[in-house]
Interface confidence: low
């Protein structure tokens, strides 16, 4: 047996063998050397590179009682769960004195059923909408041919004849399963089965049908939903008067929106209980038994102004000769918009009514015709917005002003009945 450290003498008495197997195999490579004196550390090389983190064990057995006698050194490299990255040429390496010795090589090869690098994934798609699926497999042995299956039915007549790494699906009208088979000389491996769930298409043309001060009616056009009828549509709305706003298409509004559900058909929903003259943002999604569509973009909408819901308050009207002094306060009831002004009407018992636009003032001096002998003069006041006049106050009689007496104030004890409408609760 070779001994010593002469350049021409290799200390190796056993070289690594060969391993060929399928992925996941566990195997061991072994090399043995006989040296004189202190045993060296055995290193392992793969394709000429030292394996720094090799799972190796080294056993040393002295052949004599003296340290300078010969030693048998055995190193074993364990390969657990064989992968493609483990394949290559393996050698043992030792440093003896000033010389380096390398064993004869052994080879690790991989050969078995195809191995999937990429498999089709579950996903949701809108009805009748194109999409792609991916599948990729490798040997060795090569070549590896793929065969796609839809609902367990092959899409090509033979492996390798149809689509390979990417399958283009022009659209589905029902939820379907897809898988791919990988074929090589060793046999067939089947990928996971991906479920492609068909959801309704995003609704289109979300728009306002009608606007009332406290109510908006919206409608939309549903998208295709395949063989699955729509069960309902969901409308989300958010108050957008906080200055932040929502840009069309932004993913999230400034506050979490809340939700109303609409039976379908009709693809229409009345949103009640809104604020007059207030901006909102709305979006809609429609749902089938398979799940919901994607949301439409946020649509900005705004309720129109309404008329004031009550008359001006605390109207007082006094008369001094040919002049009448009338003043009042803003209505306490909701204005439902921007107050533009007040209208005043006065009328005597036998004289026609006179109508005046006072603007935003809350008092007026009236110049009465004649000598002031008109009897039973009464005054009414109404507030108005861009939407029109609110209710008129009850008629207030003009009272004669006497020196030293405070102007009488007529409290309104009764208001005209409020029209029925949805109140803005939020």
């Amino acid at each position: 047996a070779p001994r010593g450290t002469q350049a021409e003498e290799s200390p190796f008495v056993g070289n690594p063998g060969n391993i060929t197997g399928a992925r996941g195999l566990t195997g061991t490579l072994r090399c043995q050397l006989q040296v004189q004196g202190e045993p060296p550390e055995v290193h392992w090389l793969r394709d000429g590179q030292i394996l720094e983190l090799a799972d190796s064990t080294q056993t040393q057995v002295p052949l004599g009682e003296d340290e300078q006698d010969d030693w048998i050194v055995v190193s074993q490299l364990r390969i657990t769960s064989l992968q493609l990255s483990d394949t290559g040429q393996y050698q043992c390496l030792v440093f003896l004195g000033h010389q380096t010795f390398v064993s004869q090589p052994g080879y690790v090869g991989l050969e078995g059923l195809p191995y999937f690098l990429e498999e089709p994934e579950d996903r949701t798609v809108a009805a009748n909408t194109p999409f792609n699926l991916s599948c990729q497999a490798q040997g060795p042995p090569e070549p590896v041919d793929l065969l796609w299956l839809q609902d367990a039915v092959p899409l090509a007549t033979a492996p390798g004849h149809g689509p390979q790494r990417s399958l283009h699906v022009p659209g589905l009208n029902k939820t379907s399963s897809f898988s791919c088979e990988a074929h090589n000389a060793k046999g067939v491996t089947t990928s996971r089965t991906a479920t492609i769930t068909v959801l309704p298409q995003q609704p289109r043309n979300l728009h306002l049908v009608s606007r009332q001060p406290t109510e908006l009616e919206v409608a939309w056009t549903p998208g295709l939903s395949g063989i699955y009828p729509l069960t309902h549509c969901t409308l989300q709305a958010v108050l957008s008067d906080d200055g932040m706003g929502i840009q069309a298409g932004e993913p999230d509004p400034p506050e979490e929106p809340l939700t109303s559900q609409a039976s379908v058909p009709p693809h229409q929903l009345r949103l009640g209980s809104l604020h007059p003259h207030t901006p909102y943002h709305i979006r809609v999604a429609c749902t089938s038994s398979q799940g919901p569509s994607s949301w439409t973009h946020w649509l900005p909408v705004e309720t129109p102004e309404g008329v004031p819901l009550g008359p001006p308050e605390n109207i007082s009207a006094t008369r001094n000769g040919s002049q009448a002094f009338v003043h009042w306060q803003e209505p306490r009831a909701p204005l439902q918009g921007t107050l533009l002004g007040y209208r005043l009407a006065y009328q005597g018992q036998d004289t026609p009514e006179v109508l005046m636009d006072i603007g935003l003032r809350q008092e007026v001096t009236l110049e009465l015709q004649g000598d002031g002998s008109v009897s039973n003069l009464t005054v009414c006041v109404a507030a108005y917005t861009a939407a029109g006049d609110g209710p008129w106050s009850l008629p207030v009689p003009l009272e004669a002003w006497r020196p030293g007496q405070a102007q009488p104030v007529h409290q309104l004890v009764k208001e005209p009945s409020t029209p029925a409408f949805s109140w803005p609760w939020w």
């Epitope: 809340l258 009640g272 909102y280 939020w426």
Partner: antibody, heavy 115, light 107 residues
């Protein structure tokens, strides 16, 4: 953490006045309405008054209209219920509750204060 | 005013039972209805809003349905902590109104 804390309840003679406060933390009044709901001993819930997040509107149950006034100080994040001309039938635990925008529910309530 | 009429006013049930409480509005209130649970000495808790939407953190055994005038709260499998009084409430029109309550007691 969202919290509502009522205070100001107590014993009062018929015809007297009380002012209840509802201090809010964990959210801003700017997009949230506040409502007062009461519950007489052994009875159900009765809505009293509400103030929405925008506008100057205030709303009242017919039974308290003209006697109670709801208001809010956004700088203090506090709502108030001023109760005048109190009657024996106003005896109840008064709760304030938060009203989220565009929903039909009160999602956070205070612990209540007894009047 | 819109009246909300709840039925029954009380019921006895056992743990695991399916319980249904109904609420009828005197006029159409769309889906502007909420359901609350209240235990003695405590503030009400929101369970369902907008007729059918489960409020965050509420167990999925609670569900709501209905629109227009007829609404239902269902507890699919009654648990010991569910014995309480339940109220419906409409917010479609002023004044806001509650049902008279349904007390769920242990049989």
């Amino acid at each position: 953490e969202v919290q509502l804390v009522e205070s100001g309840g107590g014993l009062v003679q018929p015809g007297g006045s009380l002012r209840l406060s509802c201090a809010a933390s964990g959210f801003s009044f700017t997009s949230i309405g506040i409502h007062w709901v009461r519950q007489a001993p052994g009875k159900g819930l009765e809505w009293v008054a509400g103030i929405p997040p925008v506008g100057r509107y205030t709303y009242y149950a017919d039974s308290v209209k003209g006697r109670f006034t709801i208001s809010a100080d956004t700088s203090k994040n506090t709502a108030y219920l001023q109760m005048n001309s109190l009657r024996a039938e106003d005896t109840a635990v008064y709760y304030c509750a938060r009203w989220r925008s565009l929903s039909s529910g009160m999602d956070y309530w205070g612990q209540g204060t007894l009047v | 005013d819109i009246q909300m009429t709840q039925s029954p006013s009380s019921l006895s049930a056992s743990v695991g039972d399916r319980v249904t409480i109904t609420c009828r509005a005197s006029q159409d209130v769309s889906t502007a209805v909420a359901w609350y649970q209240q235990k003695p000495g405590k503030a009400p808790k929101l369970l369902i809003y907008s007729a059918s939407f489960l409020y965050s953190g509420v167990p999925s055994r609670f569900s709501g349905s209905g629109s227009g005038t007829d609404f239902t709260l269902t507890i699919s499998s009654l648990q010991p902590e569910d014995f309480a009084t339940y109220y419906c409430q409409q917010s479609y029109m002023s004044p806001l109104t509650f049902g008279q309550g349904t007390k769920v007691e242990i049989k």
